[in-house]
Interface confidence: low
């Protein structure tokens, strides 16, 4: 009679993580008598996966009823596959022995490859805000994928970026891999509403890549532009001076009025108006009693934005020849937070 052969017809099996792997194995003969065992790996360090004779293997089920005497199908199913299950599986026929069974013949092995989806990319930006025209770095990380081949792209508002570096670790063989990429992005003044997107494409994603996003609103600081203008006279001895604070982001802003270098009033921007591009506008006004000044007055609008060094704009108020009354202004005295426009 021909000697028993252990046949593993599949050289390799590819399974998505979370699915069930079927490892096929048949014997060509019922003799010698003895159990089948499945191992991952070969040699002394091999790992027992299933023992027909004894043991508890909750993730493993047999394809056929091994209790049947005529059974020569020793295929198994392994459920809930993870990348850690990857490896080469051997179907081994044992000859019944005493006191122990003796290994008789092994199949050629089936390599189980696990396709594991990458984790959702996590994009993180710089710790501190930066202003337009500066270059900032964003990192993107994704883990746990297999096989190693993966494609990562960066986008800013749908436009692909080219200035980035990507590493996949580890370099050698592993059950799963991680990717780390750093992209450099040049900020522009219109970036408050912008997004940086890290897109990861992998065989497991079936053409539907994963994306991680970072809002540049968390990264950018758009400094305000100041414009100080003298409004028509409110009363015979009063002049209304406005400070228009335009196109700033984020909203955190404190404004101080100085008269000849002395602090007149400090206020915090509260009711601002949002532009289409996400920046804000705000206006403050100061009612100056001209009769209280003998000499010309230097009015300074000083703005501290988002904890940055103050910027200021000054206006020289000539007290000797101030214009006549031109109607009353609707603004309330000594308050300033008038909304400006939107974008």
């Amino acid at each position: 009679e021909e000697e028993l052969q252990v046949i593993q017809p599949d050289k390799s099996v590819l399974v998505a993580a979370g699915e069930t792997a079927t490892l096929r194995c048949t014997a060509t003969s019922l003799i010698p008598v003895g159990p089948i065992q499945w191992f991952r790996g070969a040699g002394p360090g091999r790992e027992l996966i299933y023992n027909q004779k004894e043991g508890h293997f909750p993730r493993v089920t047999t394809v056929s009823d091994l209790t049947k005497r005529n059974n020569m199908d020793f295929s198994i199913r392994i459920g809930n596959i993870t990348p850690a299950d990857a490896g080469t599986y051997y179907c081994v026929k044992f000859r019944k022995g005493s006191p122990d069974d003796v290994e008789f013949k092994s199949g050629a092995g089936t390599e189980l490859s696990v396709r594991a989806k990458p984790s959702a990319p996590v994009v993180s930006g710089p710790a501190a805000r930066a202003t337009p025209q500066h270059t900032v770095s964003f990192t993107c990380e994704s883990h746990g994928f297999s096989p190693r081949d993966i494609t990562l792209k960066w986008f800013k508002n749908g436009n692909e970026l080219s200035d980035f570096q990507t590493n996949v670790d580890p370099v050698g063989e592993s059950v799963s891999y991680s990717i780390h990429s750093t992209a450099k992005v040049v900020l522009t003044r219109e970036d408050v509403h912008s997004q940086v997107i890290c897109e990861v494409a992998h065989v497991t994603l079936q053409g539907d890549p994963l994306r991680g996003t970072a809002n540049l609103s968390e990264t950018i600081r758009v400094p305000p532009t100041l414009e100080v203008t003298q409004q028509p006279v409110r009363a015979e001895n009063q002049v209304n001076v406005t400070c228009q604070v335009r196109k700033f982001y984020p909203q955190r802003l404190q404004l101080t009025w100085l008269e000849n270098g002395n602090v007149s009033r400090t206020e915090t921007a509260s009711t601002v108006t949002e532009n289409k591009d996400g920046t804000y506008n705000w206006m403050s006004w100061l009612l100056v009693n001209v009769s209280a000044h003998r000499d010309d007055v230097k009015l300074t609008c000083q703005v501290e934005h988002d904890g940055q060094p103050a910027v200021s704009k000054s206006h020289d108020l000539k007290v000797s020849a101030h214009p006549k009354e031109q109607g009353s202004n609707t603004a309330a005295e000594n308050t300033g937070s008038n909304e400006r426009n939107i974008y």
């Epitope: 219109e190 335009r246 108006t273 909304e339 426009n341 939107i342 974008y343």
Partner: antibody, heavy 119, light 105 residues
């Protein structure tokens, strides 16, 4: 604030026109600029707008795909190119300064330039 | 779309209010045009702001999706068509009202 439009006149249907607005009296590069038109006996209609840096254009639905707005901050000019002209493009085209952006922030208007589309 | 009354009239010195209602517009401007085709003049922008060369009798307010232009102590020279401009934030669109003709009796 002065906004001076030019480039209007008699245009033929299917052709193109180029309107230019020359600005003075303010820091041009600090403001969005827009074009608004008014047909004969009609109301005002938003045409196009461009951000202060020139990087972001916005277009009204009536000209979307036919219009291109651009600006030259060095010359303090804003240009509107309108192609595939139709009779309904006839009207006075006004250049506006937008304090922030959108028609809700228009704070200054030019005198306008008249465009007549007719064969 | 935004809606404003076709016409309003008032005697000199009276207070005139013109409303402009939109679907979901958040911000408005008001523009005065004394004759068709002539250059409009912005009297109010961003709901409440008044250009420096506009008399203080012009004021603006907005509540919800409605804006109001108020002329306190209307004068004969205020006779004109007033257009409201609105930015609809939900549709990111810019629209003007059809105009309100103000007649000073």
């Amino acid at each position: 604030v002065t906004l001076d439009e030019s480039g209007g006149g008699l245009q033929t249907p299917g052709g193109g026109l180029s309107l230019v607005c020359k600005a003075s009296g303010f820091d041009f590069s600090n403001f969005n600029m827009a074009w608004v038109r008014q047909g004969p006996g009609k109301g005002l209609e938003y045409v196009a707008e461009i951000s202060d840096t020139g990087s972001t254009p916005y277009y009204g639905s009536a000209v979307q795909g036919r219009a291109t707005i651009s600006r030259d901050n060095g010359q303090s000019t804003v240009r509107l190119q309108l192609n595939n002209l139709r009779a309904e493009d006839t009207g006075t085209y006004f250049c506006t300064r937008n304090f922030g952006s959108s028609v809700s922030s228009i704070d200054a208007w030019g005198h306008g330039t008249e465009v007549i589309v007719s064969s | 779309a935004v809606t404003q009354p076709a016409s309003v009239s008032a005697n000199p010195g009276e207070t005139v209010r013109i409303t402009c209602s939109g679907d979901s517009s958040s911000y408005y401007s008001w523009h005065q045009q004394k004759s068709p085709g002539s250059a409009p003049v912005s009297v109010i922008y961003s709901n409440t702001d008044r250009p420096s060369d506009i008399p203080s009798r012009f004021s603006g307010s907005a509540s919800g999706s409605t804006a109001t232009l108020t002329i306190t102590g209307v004068q004969a020279e205020d006779e004109a068509v007033y257009f409201c401009g609105a930015y609809d934030s939900s549709s990111d669109s810019d629209i003007f009202g059809a105009g309100t003709t103000l007649t000073v009796l």
